[in-house]
Structures are given as C-alpha cells and as structure tokens.
C-alpha cells in the first residue's frame, strides 16, 4: 500500500505479487462519508497506472480488471474526481511482476589460499525481477553443515566466512544453493569437492632474479610461495615481445635455472603455484618482475664501406662508414668502435677509438698497401674485427657493372638494376650499391648509404634515407678479390618539373662564340634528378620562335658555348631545366649583342 | 497488434441521427475502459465520450451530454456511439479509443488510432 489511504482502499486479488502474464483484479473502494460533498452520484473514481488514467467509474467502488502487465513493478494509483474540485488521491497499490527462479547452474567453490574461506559462485538463470534470497549450504564429514544467505537483489556468490584445512585433504564436502520467491523455489545440483579441489594458492610473490658471475647464462629465478604448493608455471618474455615461453616446474621449492635468455635485454617474468598434479586449479599469475639480463661481448662483424678522394699528388683521404650492430648483435651498449689502420708492407699501424659516429676521415699517403680493421666493443669486451683492404674500387674497368638503371618503385623506392660484367661473372664475389643525395661540387659530409648483394643478384631495392624529389648519385661496385669496377647512374624515387630554372651569371665573347656561364638550380627546386639544359635565344623585339640547343646535364658543368649568333644583333638569353617529368619555368633573361666582325 | 476499425459515418441533415460502430482485435477489449474522439477540419483531437470496462459508467464532453450515447459489446469486441439531434458542428472524423489514449480532455498522440470515420452535417 503506499500513501495512508485515509480516505478509501485500494485490493488486489490474487495477490500483489503475480506470474508474468496473469490477470489481477484491483478495486477502490471509499471509506462512508469521504465521497464528493452532497451528491454522491457525483463521485468519479479514476483508476491511474502510473500517471495514465486505465478506468474510471461514477459511484463508491470501481473494479478493474488488468491484463498484460510487464516484469517488474507497476503502480497503480486511485483518485476522486469532484466537479469543479482537482482530482484527490485516494490510495494506491504496487503489483510486482516476475517468475519462479530458474535451477541455479553451475554452482562452483573456491577457497582462496590455504589461510582463505570458501566461497561459491553460480548462475542464477534469467531474472526473477521480484525479490528473490538464496541460501547456500555446505555439508562435511561427520554431518557439520554450514549454511549462508543473501539478499542481495542479484545473488551470484556468498562466502560461507569458514576455512578448510589440510588435515584430511581427500575428505568430500558437498554445497548445493536454494533459491527462493513468492511464485517458487528451486535448488541447484550439489557440487561435491576436496580440499586438494578447491583450494586455489596465492600468486607467488617476493620475486627475485640473480646472475651469477654477472652472466646471462647463469641465471636463477627466486620466489615465494605457501607451504603445501608442488608445481609451478613459469612464463617470461622480452619486454617488447608479446609471445610467452612457459616452463613447467614440479617441487622447484622457490628456486628455478633459467638458460635461454639473450644478453642485454630486458624480461618480464611470472610466476603461477598449484597443488596437486591434476586436481585443483592454478593460482593468478604473479605480479611481474622486470629485469635486465647482463651484457655479453658483442657477436657478428661491422658492415664497413669506405670512400678515398685524391687529394694531390701524395696523399689520400680516406673516409670509413660503419653501420650500428643490431641489437641481438651488439648484446649491450657500445661504449666504442676502434679503428685500426695499418701500412701492410712497412708494418705501420695507428689505432683509434670512436665513441658517438660510425664515421672516421683520415688522410694517408697514396704509395703503400692499407688495411683497416673495425670492431665495436661494449662492457664485455669486443666484435671480432672486419678488415678491409683499401684499393681503387673502380681501377678495374672489365669488372664495371653493364647496363646500370634505376628506376622509381612505389613511394621512396628505388630498383637499381645491373647487368654483370664482361670479365667472367664468375669472378664476383659481391656487388655493393651506395647512394648519396647528389650535391654539386661532391660534398664529401652528405651521408652515404650502402647495401651488399650476393653475386648471383642483379638488382637491389634501396629504400633507406630516400626521400621524394632528391636526386640520388648511385654506383653498383663489383668486388673481386683485391679488384673492383664499378657504374654509377643518377635517380629519384618520384619527381616533377624543376621549380625555378638555372640562372645565367656571365655571358663573355671569345672568338666570334659567346660562353654563357649559370648557377645550379638549388637543389631543392632541382625536384629530381635533371636530364638536359636548354638554352634559348631570340633576337631582341623579335616575335619569332625561339632557338634552343639542348645540353645533356653533368653535375660539373656550369658553362657552354653558342657560335650560331649574329654579329651587331641584340638577342635575349634564357635558360630551362628537365627531369623525365617536364621543363622548368625560365631562368633570368640577360641581353647580349656580339661584337665580332661580320662574314 | 492493437487493431480498431470505425465505420458507420455519413452525410446526414441536422436534427438527424448516426450510429457509429467500433470493431476492436489485438487486445483484451473487456478489460479496457474506451473512447470516441473526434477531429474537425484544421482542428485538434476532441475527447466526446468514454465507457469503462464493465459497461456500467459512462462519461460526455458538454457540448454532446443528452444527445449521444456510448455502449459497448464485449462478446463482440464492439463500441458503439449513438448520435442523434446532430449539429452542424458535429461535423469532424470521429475515432475509437482506448480510454489511457484519451480521456476527459486529455488525448494522447502516441496512442495508438485507427483511420476514422467521416461524419458531416449539413444544415
């Protein structure tokens, strides 16, 4: 009943709680003498679900009766209605809608370590949508039960506060839950078990990890866990990896050897108990311990590449490129890279060591047999060294690769291709490619990049530090023995037309010719490698067609000479720039009139 | 579903008499309190009469007390309107109703309506 019904009554038959999809009958009724004032006939009884008027009648009662009503609680409320007075609430009444409770299902008990209480869990099947309580029972040996209950409007799990020890680890208890509302009862199925069963151990913890001797292949793993455990799982992974590996250990009493870890990397580990071969369940894993395995001295060699540029008639430069150790391979951090470089004949040798480039430029005479050696060392000690002998990589022409091209390959890619050389394919032992960013006047600090090739391959994909619209000077060397030949080609991955094109600094007369001299277009409006200049000239106020001569692009050049002007004529000069993709817009225009005798 | 067909309306001179039929389906029609409304042409829903569940009280909209009468059939799942003394101002399309749709005044455009019946009064 809800409000305090002073003035009438509102019933409900069967009952205020019902099965979904029966009918109730509800009546209000007025108490003597609380009707409209005078006029009984008057009196008009509302009936409202929720705030919807459902039926009504004029007189002392009206009886309705409901169909259809949804799960869950509906409110239904009676008023009077007066002429020319508000409606007055007489009473009202809840009716809950709902079913018998469904058999619990999978009912299953757990006693969190051996200090902890059972606890059981099970399925309550649809909802009742009344008020329902279950009650949970646990029987042991020599008839002690143990009973619990809860009210909760969404019962799933009751902890019965009691703990089971391991003095007889084989005895049975069996639990079984009842659940019960107005419309019905239902029990689930008992779920009989043993101590071994349903004790589930604490995760282990204190977790510890030792090197013995600081090295990674004398390791052992150390933790905690409660008394009775007999197996344990352990799992751990680089830090970076999502892959486990699993070890499975029986009676390891808090202590395992691990052998496979790789040096210099970190590791998560885990560790999870159980207490019976096949009975019971494993505990949560572990919290995870990380740590760092020691470093070991590095493995694998140094890719080293070098370049040797003339610098006069008695001595060399020589700069010495060297790529990073992968991380598998340098097995900690490298403090440093020593170069060693030695005169083979006089027996000569210097020693260096880098820290922070894998670079090193050195000037050495031209006469005499050199050799390098590179290692990088780390904590532990040091790669075996790769050694390299200095020679002229493009000394020996039959061993030039044929028929070099390269060609853009998707989005800053580039397929250079070859074809081997004259002198017996055979003879190769490797191909290296290397590219650099082109820059007129060979800046020897552009950084250069290089691949190796077995000898079989005839072409390579390049693709680290190219960009788009960067011109790429790429040589293909054959390497053979103490001998090398080697092409060179121009390429781009993508390009387009020059953005500006070159401008005309000077233009001299000598000998009846003009020489018109430019700058380079900056290389970053060059948008590619160039093919061809254009010079253009017109005579001056002349509506003509211009004429051009066209000039195959070398990196070096910066002048060219015209002799097909006329004397005493004032022409206009310009000139263009091409890659594969078009012409540039006009340099600047000069204005020139040779002064030569005319024929 | 909720289904409920009107019929029996026409055109009819004042002073004259109608009676509208209902045929409900879909529900449980005993158990429901129900309604006649009605719509003139450019006007709102108009409540007019209303019959409860058992048959037994019945309500009118003033402007029709004493001239028309509701009744119900519950074997037949039918509600009636009994319209005499017309008015030209009775003219309007008059729909069936459960009562918590419309009721005394209060009509509720989500309930659910069927097409109608037209009645016109010609003077």
């Known amino acids: 009943k809800i409000d305090a019904c002073k003035r009438g009554d509102v019933t409900v038959k069967p009952s205020h709680v019902i099965l979904l999809g029966s009918t109730v009958n509800i009546t209000c009724s007025l108490k003597p003498r609380q009707g409209c004032f005078h006029y009984s006939r008057r009196n008009k009884l509302i009936l409202y679900k929720f705030d919807r008027r459902i039926n009504f009648h004029h007189g002392h009662s009206l009886n309705s009766q409901v169909t259809g009503l949804p799960l869950g609680t509906t409110l239904f409320v009676c008023k009077l209605a007066c002429i020319n007075s508000d409606e007055i609430q007489i009473c009202g009444a809840e009716i809950f809608v709902g079913v018998a409770p469904e058999q619990p299902q999978n009912l299953s008990c757990i006693q969190k370590g051996e200090q902890g209480t059972v606890a059981c869990t099970w399925e309550r099947g649809r909802d009742t949508h009344l008020y329902t309580e279950y009650t949970l029972q646990l029987s042991g040996p020599k008839n002690l039960t143990w009973q619990k209950q809860c009210k909760d409007i969404y019962c799933d799990y009751l902890d019965f506060g009691i703990n089971l020890t391991p003095e007889s680890p084989e005895s049975n208890f069996t639990a079984k839950v009842t659940a019960v509302n107005s419309l019905g009862s239902s029990s689930s199925l008992p779920s009989t078990f043993t101590f071994l069963d349903i004790v589930r151990p604490l995760p282990p913890w204190d977790i510890r990890i030792k090197f013995q001797k600081a090295s990674v292949s004398r390791c052992t793993l150390y933790w905690r866990d409660e008394g009775l455990v007999l197996l344990n799982r352990l799992r751990y992974r680089p830090s970076n990896s999502r892959l486990w590996n699993m070890v499975n250990v029986t009676k390891a009493k808090g202590r395992h050897d691990l052998l496979d870890l790789k040096p210099f990397t970190e590791y998560e580990f885990q560790i999870s108990s159980k207490l019976h071969l096949y009975k019971g369940s494993w505990s949560d894993w572990s919290e995870s311990l990380r740590a760092q395995t020691p470093e070991e001295e590095p493995t694998g060699m140094l890719d080293v590449w070098y370049m040797k540029r003339h610098i006069d008639y008695s001595r060399q430069q020589i700069s010495l490129f060297w790529k990073n150790l992968s991380v598998s391979e340098a097995r900690g951090k490298i403090l440093h890279y020593q170069v060693t470089l030695q005169e083979l004949t006089g027996g000569k040798a210097m020693t260096q060591n880098i820290t922070g480039h894998t670079s090193w430029t050195t000037v050495i005479p031209r006469t005499g047999n050199w050799a390098v050696a590179v290692s990088a060392a780390n904590s532990k000690g040091s790669s075996l060294p790769t050694r390299i002998n200095i020679m002229n990589l493009c000394e020996a022409g039959l061993l030039a690769p044929r028929q070099v091209s390269a060609n853009s390959e998707g989005m800053d890619n580039i397929l250079v291709t070859w074809q081997p050389p004259r002198k017996d394919p055979s003879a190769v032992q490797e191909y290296v490619v290397e590219w650099r960013e082109l820059h007129p006047g060979g800046d020897t600090q552009v950084p250069l990049n290089w691949l190796r090739s077995r000898p079989y391959n005839v072409s390579a994909l390049i693709s680290e530090n190219i960009k788009s619209y960067i011109c790429y000077e790429i040589r293909v060397y054959a390497l053979s023995g103490d001998q090398g030949g080697c092409s060179s080609i121009l390429g781009n991955s993508k390009h387009k037309a020059p953005l500006s094109g070159p401008h005309i600094n000077a233009i001299t007369e000598e000998k009846g010719s003009i020489l018109i001299s430019w700058n380079s277009i900056p290389v970053q409006e060059q948008m590619g490698c160039l093919l061809h200049y254009r010079i253009y000239w017109k005579e001056r106020d002349s509506n003509s067609q211009p004429q051009l001569c066209e000039i195959p692009y070398r990196v070096s050049q910066n002048s060219h000479p015209i002799n097909s002007l006329q004397p005493r004529v004032t022409y206009v000069l310009w000139m263009t720039a091409l890659t594969a993709a078009g012409e540039s817009s006009h340099g600047n225009e000069r204005e020139f009139c040779l002064q030569g005798k005319a024929n | 579903q909720v289904q409920l067909q009107e019929s029996g309306g026409g055109l009819v001179q004042a002073g004259g008499s109608l009676r509208l039929s209902c045929a409900a389906s879909?529900?449980?029609?005993?158990?429901?309190?129900m309604s006649w409304v009605r719509q003139a042409p450019g006007k709102g829903l108009e409540w007019v009469s209303s019959?409860?569940?058992?048959?037994?009280?019945?309500d009118y909209a003033d402007s029709v007390e004493g001239r028309f009468t509701i009744s119900r059939d519950d074997a037949k799942n039918m509600l009636f309107l009994q319209m005499n003394s017309l008015k030209p101002e009775d003219t309007a399309r008059y729909y069936c109703?459960?009562?918590?749709?419309?009721?005394?005044?209060?009509?509720?455009?989500?309930?659910?309506w069927g097409q109608g019946t037209q009645v016109t009064v010609s003077s």
């Open positions: 109703a459960k009562y918590e749709d419309c009721s005394d005044y209060v009509c509720d455009r989500a309930g659910y």
């Open positions: 879909g529900f449980t029609f005993s158990t429901y309190a």
């Open positions: 019959v409860n569940s058992g048959g037994l009280s019945t």
